[in-house]
């Protein structure tokens, strides 16, 4: 399954969401800085289009869920979170429409769901982040920043092994 | 903190083009835009493009469109700005600013004489 | 596009003196406006960014203030060193750009 041109212009238009819904200086949020410790070799070691495709669905759908939220819509604006929804549910199309053209319907890898709880458990540090820090707009802001980080590097390994194949 | 370094000073001839790096030690570079601003002698300051680098490519000042690339590599969080056609009234001190206000470089002296 | 203009051009006072510089744009401004401080020679300071929330390490005697299109940058009572010029500044997120005021000179009376 080739994800469509689209899929890759959906994902830029993701980053430029994520970028104009910054409300505040990260100068005054420096000391709520935070590693989240994305697992990135998770996307590196899914060496196949077949077992990429489940990983970055997850990784999609837990940023759709941490954006989803009540807190979440308090935080940032609207306008530009509904059509930051919009990306991410084309996104999830996309991806699940790979799926049920067969990619990855076989028996799943056990490495594949280790990949996905790795990708949920980073998520759970996420939430349990913001829920510390009280959501306030500090804490916003560095996860913004971290899932703009995150979603970038998940989606060029995307991109690399599309043109490896 | 985060430090931003800049390249030394330039001298250069009319015609040509000068790149000056920036790189920046410390902090989240891929995501917080890397603008360039410049301030010829006895002048005000004057923006001149600006990048994203996760998401690209560059955005630049009308004025400077045609000569000017602005680029950056991740992997050793360095930021680039390349000024082609230099004229005479380019002579300017060029800075790098982190798009949080705060962050700016020391500064890097292009200075174009024949 | 959006344009910043500053006044007064140039501000004569004595020290002591209270200073009230403004910036007017020429749209709606969100957050990200900022003012910086910059001496000849020197790479300009951040004062003052988001409008009215103090950097570090910049004293008590400048504010900022203001919203939509007025903002102001005020020094309570000059001293020696705030001789200088101020500019301010504004952000856009995307596409990522800076747009600055033409500068106003601070200079001793």
């Known amino acids: 399954c080739d994800l469509p041109q689209t899929h890759s212009l959906g994902s830029r238009r993701t980053l430029m969401l994520l970028a104009q819904m910054r409300r505040i200086s990260l100068f005054s949020c420096l000391k709520d800085r935070h590693d989240f410790g994305f697992p990135q070799e998770e996307f590196g070691n899914q060496f196949q289009k077949a077992e990429t495709i489940p990983v970055l669905h997850e990784m999609i759908q837990q940023i759709f869920n941490l954006f989803s939220t009540k807190d979440s819509s308090a935080a940032w604006d609207e306008t530009l979170l509904d059509k930051f929804y919009t990306e991410l549910y084309q996104q999830l199309n996309d991806l699940e429409a790979c799926v049920i053209q067969g990619v990855g319907v076989t028996e799943t890898p056990l490495m594949k769901e280790d990949s996905i709880l790795a990708v949920r458990k980073y998520f759970q540090r996420i939430t349990l982040y913001l829920k510390e820090k009280k959501y306030s707009p500090c804490a916003w802001e560095v996860v913004r920043a971290e899932i703009m980080r995150s979603f970038s590097l998940s989606t060029n390994l995307q991109e690399s092994l599309r043109s490896k194949e | 903190q985060v430090q931003l370094v800049q390249s030394g000073a330039e001298m250069k001839k009319p015609g040509s083009s000068v790149k000056v790096s920036c790189k920046d030690f410390?902090?989240?570079?891929?995501?917080?835009?890397v603008n360039w601003v410049r301030q010829a002698p006895g002048q005000g300051l004057e923006w001149m493009g600006g990048?994203?680098?996760?998401?690209?490519?560059?955005n630049y000042a009308q004025k400077f469109q045609g000569r000017i690339t602005i680029t950056a590599d991740e992997s050793t969080s360095t930021a680039y700005m390349e000024l082609s056609s230099l004229r005479f009234d380019d002579t300017a001190i060029y800075y790098c600013?982190?798009?949080?206000?705060?962050?700016w470089g020391q500064g890097t002296l292009v200075t174009v004489s024949s | 596009e959006m344009v910043l203009t500053q006044s007064p051009a140039t501000l004569s006072l004595s020290p002591g003196e209270r200073a009230t510089l403004s910036c007017r744009a020429s749209q709606t401004v969100s957050t990200f406006l900022a003012w910086y401080q910059q001496k000849p020679g020197q790479v300009p300071r951040l004062l003052v960014y988001d409008i009215s929330s103090r950097a570090n390490g910049t004293p008590a005697r400048f504010s900022g203030g203001g919203s939509g299109t007025d903002f102001t940058l005020t020094i309570s009572s000059l001293e020696l060193e705030d001789f200088a010029v101020y500019y301010c500044q504004w952000r856009s997120n995307w596409p990522p750009s800076l747009t600055f005021g033409g500068g106003t000179r601070v200079e001793i009376k």
């Open positions: 600013v982190r798009d949080d206000n705060e962050y």
């Open positions: 990048l994203i680098p996760v998401i690209g490519p560059a």
């Open positions: 410390g902090g989240t570079f891929s995501v917080y835009g």
